[in-house]
């Protein structure tokens, strides 16, 4: 089939914009670390890079292949307030490269670590 | 309490980067429209803006206050292949402004639309 050049160009552009790569996302600090429900952070979120985007096939998943760690200082507030907000420095995973991997490979990679 | 200027500056930067605003995201076309499981799109995802980020309080939710619609042309493939990929033009919601709203207001806004 022969397709209009404009259509092909716009589709190619969409592929590029949605490819699997590190993307800036907002991470909820409390959820990320599963902290006690009486502990809050200000700001409640931090900005880091995590792998995201789409892979070409149903059986593939966008997965990080390398990670750095970023230290960020936040205010921690514990209720009831025994003291004011205290500055805490927390390390966050920051994905630096990504790859579309088979879902089962991703599963195996994670579960072999969990089971150790 | 008196805090180091550097700490305050980095915290303020984090607030700004994680605020509720339209953010470029990848949307899975099939999931967005709940299409039949034998229908696939190439590319499977499109890039649009959707509200995201964090609000200052637990009771608030980042919600769109205005939306435009973007038309994007993709290839639609139906299995079993009775014909080759056919170009289809689909309209996607693109959030243009956002606001932190009370979760109850969000609920009311959504349900008033559903009930019409």
């Amino acid at each position: 089939a022969h397709y209009n050049t404009e259509i092909l160009k716009s589709i190619d552009n969409e592929w590029r914009k949605t490819q699997c790569m590190p993307r800036e996302v907002c991470i909820d600090v409390g959820k990320e670390f599963g902290v006690a429900t009486n502990t809050f952070f200000k700001p409640p979120c931090v900005s880091v890079y995590r792998c995201g985007g789409c892979c070409n096939s149903e059986g593939l998943q966008c997965m990080n292949t390398s990670t750095s760690y970023l230290s960020k200082t936040l205010f921690e507030i514990t209720v009831p307030l025994s003291q004011g907000p205290k500055p805490v420095t927390i390390s966050f995973a920051n994905h630096t490269s990504c790859r579309c991997m088979s879902k089962l490979d991703v599963y195996r990679q994670v579960h072999s670590i969990i089971r150790r | 309490a008196h805090y180091n200027t550097e700490i305050l500056k980095s915290i303020d930067n984090e607030w700004r980067k994680t605020q509720c605003m339209p953010r470029e995201v990848c949307i899975d076309v099939g999931k967005e429209f709940g299409v039949a499981t034998n229908t696939f799109f190439k590319p499977p995802c499109v890039s649009v803006y959707r509200c995201g980020g964090c609000c200052n309080s637990e009771g608030l939710q980042c919600m769109n206050t205005s939306t435009s619609y973007l038309s994007k042309t993709l290839f639609e493939i139906t299995v079993p292949l009775s014909q080759g990929p056919k170009p289809v033009t689909i309209s996607f919601a693109n959030h243009t402004s956002c606001r932190c709203m009370s979760k109850l207001d969000v609920y009311r806004q959504v349900h008033s639309i559903i009930r019409r």
Partner: antibody
């Protein structure tokens, strides 16, 4: 010893829903991926779904995608299969199975629970 | 999807005699990590399946040494050196190199 006990099966009409449970004991449930596998009467085995140790990712067979949902509650050591829009071809014994190697396959199976979809 | 083909469909064996079941996959089950993701399960009458062999040739705990697995790539074999009455049932091979996990159609082993 590893024990998996399924429950929740029964007779249901086409189009209706059913939720299966699988109670796990004898191992640290929260560290293992878990599967559902089914077997139609007199037929072979068919893989249905797989869930990560923490429930963060779920994978499904095409035959159930969009209708079935696998989930887990690690605090209760329980695996679930929510089955919606049931069809006659979903009639089978449903087994839960543990992935003991982290390799995507099964080492221990439950006894199974029979689901019959019939009008 | 990977298609798993088992032969024979059924097997009638005299106690004490050997038995052999073949399983062929439509794609290689050898992974780049060096492992081959092929497993054998036995389903005794009225019971759930039980794991016999993992990754082609490793016997699972408690499995008698009369059971052995061999093969590579796309061709695999399960052997029972001396069949006993308790070995009757349906034998299934299954691959887990990619989703969806797929089973062979099963081989029924009975005693003569």
């Amino acid at each position: 010893q590893v024990q998996l006990v399924e429950s929740g099966g029964g007779v249901v009409q086409p189009g209706r829903s059913l939720r299966l449970s699988c109670a796990a004991s004898g191992f640290t449930f929260s560290r293992y991926g878990m599967h559902w596998v089914r077997q139609a009467p007199g037929k072979g085995l068919e893989w249905v779904a797989l869930i990560w140790y923490d429930g963060s990712n779920k994978y499904y067979a095409d035959s159930v995608k969009g209708r079935f949902t696998i989930s887990r509650d690690n605090s209760k050591n329980t695996l679930y299969l929510q089955m919606n829009s049931l069809r006659a071809e979903d009639t089978a014994v449903y087994y839960c199975a543990r992935d003991g190697f982290g390799s995507g396959c099964f080492d221990y199976w439950g006894q199974g629970t029979l689901v019959t979809v019939s009008s | 999807d990977i298609v798993m083909t088992q032969t024979p469909l059924s097997l009638s064996v005299t106690p004490g005699q050997p038995a052999s079941i073949s399983c062929k996959s439509s794609q290689s089950l050898l992974h780049s990590d060096g492992k081959t993701y092929l497993y054998w399960h036995l389903q005794k009458p009225g019971q759930p399946p039980q794991l016999l062999i993992y990754e082609v040739s490793h016997r699972f705990s408690g499995v008698p040494d009369r059971f052995s697995g061999s093969g590579s790539g796309t061709d695999f074999t399960l052997k029972i050196s001396r069949v006993e009455a308790e070995d009757v049932g349906l034998y299934y091979c299954v691959q887990s190199i990619q989703l969806p996990l797929t089973f062979g159609g099963g081989t029924k082993v009975e005693i003569k």
